[in-house]
């Protein structure tokens, strides 16, 4: 004969665990149903009645199967330096990421708590390491023979042009200036 399927709530066999999408209620001492994502427990189970679930209210969510009595609050609205990459729904929290030109200075479990503008390297300095979603730009002084004449978070130090005859020598923040004879790189 096939084993009889137990309907929640039921007392688990000694040493066994509750099934998928169930939890062991320590007060009722029964395996009871969890609530689906987007819901929360409105009434906990008893020995004879299963969990009663209810939908999360606006601006709250549950992402997992659960038996929490209250849904989690969605995070606050994204700030002006952020972009909402995932909206707040009953099943997921809002995710804010930094807009272009900014990086995440203080991250949270998902998305970013605090964005900061990417550092701009001033003339005479170029980008040694580009910024990422979570790290700032690293600048370095332009080495002899190279220059950067911009204030930029993306420009690297470029080589001076090579002149047949130099009118003005280049430096870290300025390219060389050649006389009218055509320069070479």
């Amino acid at each position: 004969l096939p084993a009889q399927v137990a309907f929640t709530p039921y007392a688990p066999e000694p040493g066994s665990t509750c099934r998928l999408r169930e939890y062991y209620d320590q007060t009722a001492q029964m395996c009871c149903s969890k609530c689906s994502p987007g819901q929360h427990a409105k009434v906990f189970c008893t020995k004879t009645s299963d969990t009663v679930c209810d939908s999360c209210e606006d601006s709250t969510y549950t992402q997992l199967w659960n038996w929490v009595p209250e849904c989690l609050s969605c995070g606050s609205r994204c700030s002006s330096d952020q972009v909402e990459t995932q909206a707040c729904t009953r099943e997921q929290n809002r995710i804010c990421t930094c807009r272009p030109g900014w990086y995440c200075a203080l991250s949270k479990q998902e998305g970013c708590r605090l964005c900061a503008p990417l550092r701009k390297c001033r003339p005479g300095f170029g980008v040694a390491r580009p910024g990422t979603e979570t790290s700032d730009v690293v600048c370095k002084p332009c080495a002899p023979g190279t220059f950067s004449n911009t204030t930029s978070s993306t420009d690297i130090c470029r080589p001076h042009q090579i002149c047949n005859v130099v009118a003005i020598p280049g430096n870290a923040s300025m390219d060389a200036v050649c006389t009218s004879t055509s320069p070479t790189r």
Epitope: K42, V43, T46, K47
Partner: antibody, heavy 119, light 106 residues
Framework: QVTLKESGPGILQPSQTLSLTCSFS??????????VGWIRQPSGKGLEWLAH???????YYNPALKSRLTISKDTSKNHVFLKIANADTADTATYYC???????????WGTGTTVTVSS | DIQMTQSPSSLSASLGDKVTITCKAS??????IAWYQHKPGEGPRLLIH???TLQPGIPSRFSGSGSGSDYSFSINNLEPEDIASYYC????????FGGGTKLEIK
């Protein structure tokens, strides 16, 4: 408006059965998720949970007192009863009944009834 | 059974002070803790449930926090009507009260 009121014998002798009644209004024990529990407080001491009954008649007892406690309800009259067998002087206390929510905390309490067990 | 250790058992504070009471559970209670105010001749009054959810009508001076087995309850800007005893209640596994804290004015 939810209200609960406890009543009891006032005074009784050791070894007798202590009988308490909780009369409530503003909610029904026919309603899903509703429950009523009993809590006591001996004079000068803290609160102690005794027993609880749910809308579906499921019952829970304090393990230390379980053998002496019986909780029951009369849903039609909005009454919950608690009996404590073999009363002792240590059972002298103020007894409270309280409504319990579906997520298991007491949200509204009665003002209590004082019971003295003395010979 | 879960034991709840509440401290301090008594507390003397001045009006306007912030006071904090703690409850430690003998095991993880998954945020299932409530806090009650109890005045003589009255039934206890629910202030907070599920660790930090303020009951409707309760002033925001009252707050709760914690997780696992460690929980705290605070009253900001103490007022004369706050003089009472305070109890925590764990409802993660059956129901157990803390021993209570009697709050007095200096």
């Amino acid at each position: 408006q939810v209200t609960l009121k406890e009543s009891g014998p006032g005074i009784l002798q050791p070894s007798q059965t202590l009988s308490l009644t909780c009369s409530f209004s503003g909610f029904s024990l026919n309603t899903l998720g509703m429950g009523v529990g009993w809590i006591r407080q001996p004079s000068g001491k803290g609160l102690e949970w005794l027993a609880h009954i749910w809308w579906d008649a499921d019952k829970y007892y304090n393990p230390a007192l379980k053998s002496r406690l019986t909780i029951s309800k009369d849903t039609s009259k909005n009454h919950v009863f608690l009996k404590i067998a073999n009363a002792d002087t240590a059972d002298t206390a103020t007894y409270y009944c309280a409504r319990m929510t579906g997520t298991r905390y007491f949200d509204v309490w009665g003002t209590g009834t004082t019971v003295t067990v003395s010979s | 059974d879960i034991q709840m250790t509440q401290s301090p058992s008594s507390l003397s504070a001045s009006l306007g002070d912030k006071v904090t009471i703690t409850c430690k559970a003998s095991q993880n209670i998954n945020k299932f803790i409530a806090w009650y105010q109890h005045k003589p001749g009255e039934g206890p009054r629910l202030l907070i449930h599920y660790t930090s959810t303020l009951q409707p009508g309760i002033p925001s001076r009252f707050s709760g926090s914690g997780s696992g087995s460690d929980y705290s309850f605070s009253i900001n800007n103490l007022e004369p009507e706050d003089i009472a005893s305070y109890y925590c209640l764990q409802y993660g596994v059956l129901w157990t009260f803390g021993g209570g804290t009697k709050l007095e004015i200096k």
